[in-house]
Amino acid sequence: SPGPVPPSTALRELIEELVNITQNQKAPLCNGSMVWSINLTAGMYCAALESLINVSGCSAIEKTQRMLSGFCPHKVSAGQFSSLHVRDTKIEVAQFVKDLLLHLKKLFREGRFN
């Protein structure tokens, strides 16, 4: 079986998936569902997954949820929250995805793949 995916490749694939989501918005993403905003800092992959995993019935982000789980070292389930969430701020999934995409672009440019 193939070896582990290099971090740079995994991050690139995640960015490409977020690009696809951003590009293919014909109607409000996930019917305009709201999710908790997160601090885009260390541990953000788990925080992002914790936030998005609470969105159900939205096929557009299912692949993103799976990909984020590959970046998060622990199992994440719905209703689970870390200190990285800005618990007083909810934003639309579309805005969440855009913010995450732009932050990951910065990380990729800076060579911060983990």
């Epitope: 690139r12 960015i15 490409e16 690009v19 951003t22 590009q23 293919n24 918005q25 014909k26 579309a94 805005q95 855009k98 995409l101 732009l102 672009k105 990729f108 440019r109």
Partner: antibody, heavy 122, light 108 residues
Framework: EVQLLESGGGLVQPGGSLRLSCAAS????????MSWVRQAPGKGLEWVSA????????YYADSVKGRFTISRDNSKNTLYLQMNSLRAEDTAVYYC???????????????WGQGTLVTVSS | SYVLTQPPSVSVAPGQTARITCGGN??????VHWYQQKPGQAPVLVVY???DRPSGIPERFSGSNSGNTATLTISRVEAGDEADYYC???????????FGGGTKLTVL
Amino acid sequence: EVQLLESGGGLVQPGGSLRLSCAASGFTFSSYAMSWVRQAPGKGLEWVSAISGSGGSTYYADSVKGRFTISRDNSKNTLYLQMNSLRAEDTAVYYCAKADFWSGTLWGFDYWGQGTLVTVSS
Amino acid sequence: SYVLTQPPSVSVAPGQTARITCGGNNIGNKIVHWYQQKPGQAPVLVVYDDSDRPSGIPERFSGSNSGNTATLTISRVEAGDEADYYCQVWDSSSDHVVFGGGTKLTVL
């Protein structure tokens, strides 16, 4: 230092053809999407065409689709624009621009050439 | 196709703040870039990804984007800031790059 140098502009009659080139240096050419943007005299910027880093995906403005063809030779670090069936309204300065990320669609253009003037007139 | 609307001109006194708007339907969901173009010169990227500044661009240049309006803000305007400014997005519904019509900034 990133450099983009356009060439191939000039005077051409309506219905004629022209091929623009953009020689790139100072960056890993194949890793970035590239684009052509034009500016008619005294007018604003108008996007013409774009191409992915591999050359596998191409995009065109409606005004040039079917007449212009964008391509690239990554072994020569060169971007091309083949312009056929030229019209008077194609008269403009044509800029070559580098996308600031490998996926050229959502990103901006961080480096531009100085442009080459194309004049379509009889 | 997607349309970006900019005011044709904005005037401001030196030292004041200039705000150049770029209107578009739900532009807040898109990623906006801004270019400065001086007469006879190629455009220069001054703000990318809504609000980031390329290296070498003064901190006086900043951007924001939400709702139906993106804004380029130039604080402490200098005479050298006089130029045309263009906003730009990618329109995924048409697979086109879209530029605004441009705004001429005049420093009084």
